[in-house]
Amino acid sequence: MRRGPRSLRGRDAPAPTPCVPAACFDLLVRHCVACGLLRTPRPKPAGASSPAPRTALQPQE
């Protein structure tokens, strides 16, 4: 049985490595992948409160 890629990581893992442009950090397996491989939360309806903060998931600027 294949172990989950995150099984051996501790709570104090270092911050995610910056991804190259057009790559996003996959928080579930802790590495950079093409952004198109990840599915982001559904966008909030117009006028919804509290926009989601920027995270390491998004491409580096």
Partner: antibody, heavy 117, light 111 residues
Framework: EVQLQESGPSLVKPSQTLSLTCSVT????????WNWIRKFPGNKLEFMGY???????YYNPSLKSRISITRDTSKNQYYLQLNSVTTEDTATYYC???????????WGQGTTLTVSA | DIVLTQSPVSLAVSLGQRATISCRAS??????????MHWYQQKPGQPPKLLIY???DLESGIPARFSGSGSGTDFTLTINPVETDDVAIYYC?????????FGGGTKLEIK
Amino acid sequence: EVQLQESGPSLVKPSQTLSLTCSVTGDSITRGYWNWIRKFPGNKLEFMGYINYSGTTYYNPSLKSRISITRDTSKNQYYLQLNSVTTEDTATYYCATPHTYGAMDYWGQGTTLTVSA
Amino acid sequence: DIVLTQSPVSLAVSLGQRATISCRASESVDDYGISFMHWYQQKPGQPPKLLIYRASDLESGIPARFSGSGSGTDFTLTINPVETDDVAIYYCQQTSKDPWTFGGGTKLEIK
């Protein structure tokens, strides 16, 4: 809108193998994560495992070596195989897909499995 | 495994009042400044429905009566005001560490 639909037997005998299919529409299983979750009669939910965009699998250690999750990208389906079932595997089985934080925002309706001789 | 303990197991609240459900994790579910804690509602014969993700973010289409708070090991789901349609079982879930785990559920009833 992503839609998931489970299919498979409703009754399996002890020691047999359970095989379930999750058919996905509205998105490709070559992106994201594709999970199996089950709910036992006492209302406990258990995460069983996933297969992700790259075909990488993760299995809950509680299921030991009994579980296998595979996929057929040409059919946009993924599959659960659970070997050597017992009455303890009686549950409602769901397929679901999470977004980037692991929160599962799309679920199938579930298929109820009874393991009985 | 991270164990999630929900309390109370069942809760009866009057219409229009506040319902508060607690979820305590056996270890922190925070990483990268994110709380990997989510809340679901499940009604009989239906799959769970995502209400809150990342501890406090309201899922699209969920009414603002639902809110989440907390970080580290202690999290709270609040429903205010409670409506008849809220009768269900509520679950917390963590995705910080494998295997992902769920709380035991809290059954909400109307008093």
